[in-house]
């Protein structure tokens, strides 16, 4: 009688993560008597995957009924496949022996490859805000995919970016891989509504790439421009001075009025108006009683924006001249800022 052969007809099997892998194996003879076992890998460090008679293998089922009298089909199914299951599987026939059964013949092996989807890309920006014209870095990470081949692209408002560096780890063979990419983005004053998108394409995604986004509103700081103007007289001896704070982002802003260097009033921006580009405008005004002053008054609008060093703009109010002849007559909307009389 011809010596028993162990046949594994499939050189390789490709399975998607989460699915069931079928590993086929048949023997050509019932002799010698002894169990079939399945291993992943070869040599002394091999991992036992299934033993016909003992062991605990909750993920493994047999394709045919191994208990049937002349059964020679030793194929198995492994459920809920993960990338960690990738490797070469051997169907091995043992001959009963003492004290232990003896390996008699092995199949040629079946390589199990696992296709696993990448995780949703996570995009993170710089820890601190930056101002327009500065270059900031964004990182994108995705994990757990297999095989290693993957494509990553960066976009800003739909326009593809070119200044980025990408690494796929590890470099050598692994059950699954991770991708890490860093893109450099130059900020503009119009970027409050902008988005940076990281797009990952992989064979498991069937042409429907995964995207991760970051809003530049989390990253950008647009410093305000200040303009101090003197408004028409409201009453004899009273002058209205306004401070226009324009095009700032984020909203966190504190304004202080100074008279000749002394703090007159401090307020926090509340009822702001939003511009189309996402930046904000705000106006504060001060009512000055000129008759209370003998000398000229230097009025300063000092603004601290988003915790940054204060910026200021000053306006000289000449007491000697008649109020009606002074300053600009530009009409300004009264935003309801608190009145402040100087006596």
């Amino acid at each position: 009688e011809e010596e028993l052969q162990v046949i594994q007809p499939d050189k390789s099997v490709l399975v998607a993560a989460g699915e069931t892998a079928t590993l086929r194996c048949t023997a050509t003879s019932l002799i010698p008597v002894g169990p079939i076992q399945w291993f992943r890998g070869a040599g002394p460090g091999r991992e036992l995957i299934y033993n016909q008679k003992e062991g605990h293998f909750p993920r493994v089922t047999t394709v045919s009924d191994l208990t049937k009298r002349n059964n020679m089909d030793f194929s198995i199914r492994i459920g809920n496949i993960t990338p960690a299951d990738a490797g070469t599987y051997y169907c091995v026939k043992f001959r009963k022996g003492s004290p232990d059964d003896v390996e008699f013949k092995s199949g040629a092996g079946t390589e199990l490859s696992v296709r696993a989807k990448p995780s949703a890309p996570v995009v993170s920006g710089p820890a601190a805000r930056a101002t327009p014209q500065h270059t900031v870095s964004f990182t994108c990470e995705s994990h757990g995919f297999s095989p290693r081949d993957i494509t990553l692209k960066w976009f800003k408002n739909g326009n593809e970016l070119s200044d980025f560096q990408t690494n796929v780890d590890p470099v050598g063979e692994s059950v699954s891989y991770s991708i890490h990419s860093t893109a450099k983005v130059v900020l503009t004053r119009e970027d409050v509504h902008s988005q940076v998108i990281c797009e990952v394409a992989h064979v498991t995604l069937q042409g429907d790439p995964l995207r991760g986004t970051a809003n530049l509103s989390e990253t950008i700081r647009v410093p305000p421009t200040l303009e101090v103007t003197q408004q028409p007289v409201r009453a004899e001896n009273q002058v209205n001075v306004t401070c226009q704070v324009r095009k700032f982002y984020p909203q966190r802003l504190q304004l202080t009025w100074l008279e000749n260097g002394n703090v007159s009033r401090t307020e926090t921006a509340s009822t702001v108006t939003e511009n189309k580009d996402g930046t904000y405008n705000w106006m504060s005004w001060l009512l000055v009683n000129v008759s209370a002053h003998r000398d000229d008054v230097k009025l300063t609008c000092q603004v601290e924006h988003d915790g940054q060093p204060a910026v200021s703009k000053s306006h000289d109010l000449k007491v000697s001249a008649h109020p009606k002849e002074q300053g600009s007559n530009t009409a300004a909307e009264n935003t309801g800022s608190n009145e402040r009389n100087i006596y």
């Epitope: 036992l48 003992e54 208990t67």
Partner: antibody
């Protein structure tokens, strides 16, 4: 549902023999090895041996060679452990387990006493 | 035969404490064949960890197993009262199969 039902407690005299049974339900014993394990009060587990009920092949720990005999009857889906020449050292709980040790019988207490 | 030595033989731990039980083999054991069992008084042993690091069905995730060659361990990340029991390691890599002497784990 897999279950292993063991026979009841035994009180035996020194020098005598005893035969314990382990009846399986929820699986066919022909398909798996059946192991026997000894546990003395407040002590560890000792593997006695196992049988392949399909062909009757047995393996024993050296310590139990000659002391224990494991047999099986596939028609009744039952495995047996026979202990002979009993001494006080054999007083213990004896448990059967399905190959893989995921399922155990409830144990049988054997007390050897004059 | 392969002798499995467990340490400590007895130990107590406070709730929330991290606990590590060790099992040392006199010669190398393939990790596929190293199992752990939990046993409570009056009950049969329960399969707790199989193939060194896989938790049996129903075993809480605070348990983990690791090791290779001659050195294996069972770890409880945060001890709970219900974990008080005896734990036995077991090898079925080669005949005769053997069990460790056990570690009795008590709650403080």
């Amino acid at each position: 549902e897999v279950q292993l039902q063991q026979s009841g407690a035994e009180l035996v005299k020194p020098g005598a023999s005893v035969k314990l049974s382990c009846t399986a339900s929820g699986f066919n014993i022909k398909d798996y090895y059946i192991h026997w394990v000894k546990q003395r009060t407040e002590q560890g587990l000792e593997w006695i041996g196992r049988i392949d009920p399909e062909d009757g092949e047995t393996k024993y720990a050296p310590k139990f060679q000659g002391k224990a005999t494991i047999t099986a009857d596939t028609s009744s889906n039952t495995a047996y452990l026979q202990l002979n020449s009993l001494t006080s050292e054999d007083t213990a709980v004896y448990s059967c387990a399905k190959g893989g040790f995921a399922y155990w019988g409830q144990g049988t207490l054997v007390t050897v006493s004059a | 035969q392969i002798v499995l030595t467990q340490s400590p033989a007895i130990m107590s731990a406070s709730p929330g404490e991290k606990v590590t039980l060790t099992c040392s083999a006199s010669s190398s054991v393939s990790s596929s064949y190293l199992y752990w069992y939990q046993q409570k008084p009056g009950s049969s042993p329960k399969l707790w960890i199989y193939s060194t690091s896989n938790l049996a069905s129903g075993v809480p995730a605070r348990f983990s197993g690791s090791g290779s060659g001659t050195s294996y361990s069972l770890t409880i990340s945060s001890m709970e009262a219900e974990d008080a029991a005896s734990y036995f390691c077991h090898q079925w890599s080669s005949h005769p199969y053997t069990f460790g002497g056990g570690t009795k784990l008590e709650i403080k």
